[in-house]
């Protein structure tokens, strides 16, 4: 598993460095998660040919994965800091059930999958401290999440491989869009 943010060799070598700002910590946390996703995708791609599937083919799925849209205020046009931050936090909370699903999907990268899940929880906490309007953030319903998890786990092997690939790719794209937007805040 990659070294958690704040524990890399550079930090050890420079103990008197300025402490990270809130934005730097968030940036580092997202990149740490992205690194974890890359490692998980390597195992997924080695195991199945999902990674060769076209994006169009993958889009034909019934997963309701969080996605950035123009209305969310995170893009160049119509950028809105508060709306965007709410979307990022809400999206991350919605991804949590999918990250839970990933926990039993990896053999050699079990720790890595756990690290991605735990790091995402930490990222959500960081971002909630940054948000002014916490009331606007909708938390997913636990009962709905539980039945979704059961449904995903009941799929056949091929669909489970497809689901794993889609979750990782979508989560990566969501995090990248989030990081770009957060850089402007």
């Amino acid at each position: 598993a990659p070294v958690p943010p704040g524990e890399d060799s550079k930090d050890v070598a420079a103990p008197h460095r300025q402490p990270l700002t809130s934005s730097e910590r968030i940036d580092k946390q997202i990149r740490y998660i992205l690194d974890g996703i890359s490692a998980l995708r390597k195992e997924t791609c080695n195991k199945s040919n999902m990674c060769e599937s076209s994006k169009e083919a993958l889009a034909e799925n019934n997963l309701n994965l969080p996605k950035m849209a123009e209305k969310d205020g995170c893009f160049q046009s119509g950028f809105n800091e508060e709306t965007c931050l709410v979307k990022i936090i809400t999206g991350l909370l919605e991804f949590e059930v999918y990250l839970e699903y990933l926990q039993n999907r990896f053999e050699s990268s079990e720790e890595q999958a756990r690290a991605v899940q735990m790091s995402t929880k930490v990222l959500i906490q960081f971002l909630q401290k940054k948000a002014k309007n916490l009331d606007a953030i909708t938390t997913p319903d636990p009962t709905t999440n539980a039945s979704l998890l059961t449904k995903l786990q009941a799929q056949n092997q091929w669909l489970q491989d497809m689901t794993t690939h889609l979750i990782l790719r979508s989560f990566k794209e969501f995090l990248q869009s989030s990081l770009r937007a957060l850089r402007q805040m």
Partner: antibody
Framework: EVQLQESGPGLVKPSQTLSLTCTVS??????????WSWIRQPPGKGLEWIGV???????YYSPSLKSRVSISWDTSKNQFSLKLSSVTPADTAVYYC??????????????WGQGTMVTVSS | QSALTQPPSVSGTPGQSVTISCAGA?????????VSWYQQLPGTAPKLMIY???TRASGIPDRFSGSKSGNTASLTISGLQAEDEADYYC??????????FGTGTKLTVL
């Protein structure tokens, strides 16, 4: 020092598929956050972004070319490739490959190949 | 996918300052700090000059500077020299991992 070198046929017939390869030396194409783009320049005209393949092998294409373009890689050879189908004379251009050092928050190209001229003509 | 708009040509005499503008449509440039500038000499590949709006690439003299105001980015070259004569292109990130280039500007040193 990172170096990029384009290769492929200089002449392609209309309606055929244009295929180019970019060989990268001095660094791995799978290094984290790097991305590898194809950019073209018709004679006497400006630069046009075609598409990109990132450090995970994910691809993104220009909306205007999306239906005809495909970018892939061969990590064992440290190469990435461009395929453009159903070409017309309007696709005649110098084709460049280039590196983005940080696809997450970079969006700039610090290393370029020298470019290869492709003419579409029967 | 419409290109960013640049003036077709600008000119100046040695020692002067010139500014090349790069205007975005649909707020391409407005919010995000992902504008870069490239110099292209005849028959050669473009060369990175400025990235992230204001950061000079390695080895680029401080005569070259970048800025942004609203939906327009600018490249300023001060103390113009004969070897600065070239085509200049801006580029920007566009939503969904897309990039777009400017129309290009021919700089002539008189």
């Amino acid at each position: 020092e990172v170096q990029l070198q384009e290769s492929g046929p200089g002449l392609v017939k209309p309606s055929q598929t244009l295929s180019l390869t970019c060989t990268v030396s001095g660094g791995s194409i799978t290094s984290r956050y790097y991305a590898w783009s194809w950019i073209r320049q018709p004679p006497g005209k400006g630069l046009e972004w075609i598409g990109v393949i990132d450090y995970d092998g994910d691809t993104y294409y220009s909306p205007s070319l999306k239906s005809r373009v495909s970018i892939s890689w061969d990590t064992s050879k440290n190469q990435f490739s461009l395929k453009l189908s159903s070409v017309t004379p309007a696709d005649t251009a110098v084709y460049y490959c280039a590196r983005d050092p940080d696809v997450v928050t970079g969006f700039h190209y610090d290393y370029w190949g020298q470019g290869t001229m492709v003419t579409v003509s029967s | 996918q419409s290109a960013l708009t640049q003036p077709p040509s600008v000119s100046g005499t040695p020692g002067q300052s010139v500014t090349i503008s790069c205007a975005g449509a649909n707020n391409d440039i407005g919010t995000y700090a992902y504008v870069s500038w490239y110099q292209q000499l005849p028959g050669t590949a473009p060369k990175l000059m400025i990235y992230k709006v204001t950061t000079r690439a390695s080895g680029i003299p401080d005569r070259f500077s970048g800025s942004k105001s609203g939906n327009t980015a600018s490249l300023t070259i001060s103390g113009l020299q004969a070897e600065d004569e070239a085509d200049y292109y801006c580029a920007s990130y566009r939503n969904f991992n897309n990039a777009v280039f400017g129309t290009g500007t021919k700089l002539t040193v008189l």
